[in-house]
Amino acid sequence: RKLEKQGSCRKKCFDASFRGLENCRCDVACEDRGDCCWDFEDTCVESTRIWTCNKFRCGETRLEASLCSCSDDCLQRKDCCADYKSVCQGETSWLEENCDTAQQSQCPEGFDLPPVILFSMDGFRAEYLYTWDTLMPNINKLKTCGIHSKYMRAMYPTKTFPNHYTIVTGLYPESHGIIDNNMYDVNLNKNFSLSSEEQNNPAWWHGQPMWLTAMYQGLKAATYFWPGSEVAINGSFPSIYMPYNRSVPYEERISTLLKWLDLPKAERPSFYTMYFEEPDSSGHASGPVSARVIKALQVVDHAFGMLMEGLKQRNLHNCVNIILLADHGMDQTYCNKMEYMTDYFPRINFYMYEGPAPRIRALNVPHDFFSFNSEEIVRNLSCRKPDQHFKPYLTPDLPKRLHYAKNVRIDKVHLFVDPQWLAVGSKSNTNCGGGNHGYNNEFRSMEAIFLAHGPSFKEKTEVEPFENIEVYNLMCDLLRIQPAPNNGTRGSLNHLLKVPFYKPSHAEEVSKFSVCGFANPLPTDNLSCLCPHLQNSIQLEQVNQMLNLTQEEITATVKVNLPFGRPRVLQKNVDNCLLYHREYVSGFGKAMRMPMWSSYTVPQLGDTSPLPPTVPDCLRADVRVPPSESQKCSFYLADENITHGFLYPPAINRTSDSQYDALIMSNLVPMYEEFRKMWDYFHSVLLIKHATERNGVNVVSGPIFDYNYDGHFDAPEEITKHIANTDIPIPTHYFVVLTSCKNKSHTPENCPGWLDVLPFIIPHRPTNVESCPEGKPEALWVEERLTAHIARVRDVELLTGLDFYQDKAQPVSEILQLKTYLPTFETTI
């Protein structure tokens, strides 16, 4: 051994005076002379290029050129390689350590608040985590020991900049302004792209990113790359930030972050970001299912392991709250799956943002920006081919769950593209093949990862999917600071935490309700309505008397038809009253002269055959509502394509007479005739199917007014369409929220545990062109159309100013989980 040592460069690297066995040398020139000792390459050269220790390096003489040190004094000097303790001192590595040793929070002296590390791996789709888990031991360990979701939903469009900035602001792209990687703002008259300096203009970046939220509340923040971190947002940069340079090795990024954690307490940040370009780069180049992606996953896993090992070396591995996530997923694209605009237009006289989430605007901007006829473009792209692989939308008509409309940068024409397809201008575009993203955020291929570990997080837990707008509030809770206003629902991720910091409570009702009292069984004004079936005033009196419920009957109908409580009204100054019926309850909005909501429970019926037809041509005044607050039947005669629909379907009756409880003006809402076809099919066929499958469903439905398409209920003066020129407004959408018991052995009104929700927000349009229904029966298109417009209960709440489930005996944070849940039916990736 002694002889071997004498022939070794160990501790002798670049020492010009050293002469080893057989006169071997370890100086800089030995390679030129050819007299290097046997281990010169491994011990001296390789050591300056690697970020790890090994048996050659342990105890090495400090090398100026090395990236990190394995010398005996490196711990004091704070420049050890991340794995020094495990390789050179025989400690158990983080990877080998048992999860169970991480039971209690272990923060060293000076770490009063557990630091938060937000780590993004671009384009890491959720499926990779399950398919390639054995190739990613470090990430897999984090998944096993910490908490993870089945997936995290990206926001639309599922692109890098919009989603990274959403994660750190809690805002939808329409709210924070970064609506795509490429965009035009007519007010700035500038173009934003990832390749131009313009991206660093603060005018593009709205909202308050996490680093500023932390800094405004006395904490320091450090970003090792993150979209927006090099921009003087609101005039400020993060406390520490790095100018973006994609060629910085991942190990160098990790090493720098670890050095920031070594800073003295007064200088040390509490919040950190880390960004890796992989596996996105490889996914684009070769597609998601490729050797290149597998290699990239191994690379990022190794670098992540270096971080965890470095944390362990500092005894921070059970002190730091680390969140590992992605911005979006990845899908395969093909050069034979291209939609060309030249197939739809004789000439392309518009500008198109091409790809998986295309937008179309005027070519000549700013001059033609506002006068560009978007409606005409959408018309020319609608229902043109039987196998069309995109659906054109005016952005206000996009599914509301996307929240992708209210920003001047979001061009009015939008193409919703099928998975794996691309929509481009012409065949001159050959940017296809490999992988891409940007598609519908419900596609499984677009799902992103979310894993977390640390003293604040629960351990060994898998949670249901959630949306990335919720992460900002979560990080604020981890840092015990107040979030800026955002689109997340604070408290909805409390189930990820051992001890939640924020305790949510139900919203206070803003507008009190009254009860529309029953005074007289005969109306003072028949509102131009007719019901030939009620041939005299005695019959009319009889059916109207049915609307006069006793207190016992009110209690009974509330128990069955409002099992989770009455929706609370959070809009200001809304004069509303409750209307009780044996089979439904509704909240009547006096200013709008229509029900704001109607609630009823459909039991599990014996058979699933469609409902019988409603009594035809029979409508009458509701004697509980003054004529001045009611619609009139005559309103509907003047507007040919507007008819009336019923919120509570009269055909769902339990007795032959009870149908008359629904054939009243207070149950009426204006509907386009084409829309009503879908509405009626839903209630007579699909609703019965749902009730049968779920052991009964509670239904709450009602109108929505969002003419300014901002995702929030409109002020009355913002409403632009009215029936027959009266002040009866025409809704922009209708909502339907189906609620059943998760445990299907219970009915909705006797549900002890979790609820299941299926909310729809259906655009109310004069035609069904969105479904290209020509010559097709409703069975072929209605369900597909409704599924496209599934939303969260929270989306319904924002659009209506109502608040649901307040009387459900369940912790509020669990109710918020329910409200932020988005049902999905995507099965294939």
Epitope: E375, K412, P716, D727
Partner: antibody, heavy 115, light 107 residues
Framework: EVQLVESGGGRVKPGGSLRLSCAAS????????MNWVRQAPGKGLEWVSS????????KYADSVKGRFTMSRDNAKNSLFLQMNSLRDEDMAVYYC????????WGQGTLVTVSS | EIVMTQSPATLSVSPGERATLSCRAS??????LAWYQQKPGLAPRLLIY???TRATGIPARFSGSGSGTEFTLTISSLQSEDFAVYYC?????????FGQGTKVEIK
């Protein structure tokens, strides 16, 4: 038959005030939002103000904001426009019109502003 | 505010001929557009609302089309009583705005 009859026009000095009225009949007044539109001599139409059926909102053109006040009395089927601080450029025929698109108009009342 | 631009300012047409009037909005007004006819000394009269729906009592020779930013009023065969000034107006946004008018005169 729907009828709208304006009154209250006349000659007034700059800085003066006038109150216009519009009497409605032949329809349920409380079902409709109402509007004032004016037309200067030899010029086109200019929207002045709108009020919703139950007065939950009133909207004004920038040119009259802070000077004109629109109101209604549903019990009396009446619409009003209180015009203060009148200017030369306010001289016009003032029409009241029904609904969100103006399906019925009155015959108009002339407001003359001159010193 | 949304600027409504009508063209032409004056249209000279012979009785029995077709007249096509254009109205352009500076930004989309969806289909919330109305057309009015005004004869000298009289109040305007509603012809078309919702861009294409004829108002009560309006003859079938009047038709409206368009949506978004481009709209057209067509009078298929001009009668003597149709010579007047025609205004378009949007009711999609506040403030409500009118076009400057197109005068249809006898050729």
């Amino acid at each position: 038959e729907v009828q709208l009859v304006e009154s209250g026009g006349g000659r007034v000095k700059p800085g003066g005030s006038l109150r216009l009225s519009c009497a409605a009949s032949g329809f349920t007044f409380s079902d409709y939002s109402m509007n004032w539109v004016r037309q200067a001599p030899g010029k086109g139409l200019e929207w002045v103000s709108s009020i919703s059926s139950i007065s939950s909102y009133v909207k004004y053109a920038d040119s009259v904001k802070g000077r004109f006040t629109m109101s209604r009395d549903n019990a009396k089927n009446s619409l009003f426009l209180q015009m203060n601080s009148l200017r030369d450029e306010d001289m016009a025929v003032y029409y009241c019109a029904r609904g969100h698109y103006f399906d019925y108009w009155g015959q108009g009342t002339l407001v003359t502003v001159s010193s | 505010e949304i600027v409504m631009t009508q063209s032409p300012a004056t249209l000279s047409v012979s009785p029995g001929e077709r007249a096509t009037l254009s109205c352009r909005a500076s930004q989309s007004v969806s289909s919330n557009l109305a057309w009015y006819q005004q004869k000298p000394g009289l109040a305007p009269r509603l012809l078309i609302y919702g861009a294409s729906t004829r108002a009560t009592g309006i003859p079938a020779r009047f038709s409206g089309s368009g949506s978004g930013t481009e709209f057209t009023l067509t009078i298929s065969s001009l009668q003597s009583e149709d010579f007047a000034v025609y205004y378009c107006q949007q009711y999609n946004n506040w403030p409500r705005t009118f076009g400057q008018g197109t005068k249809v005169e006898i050729k």
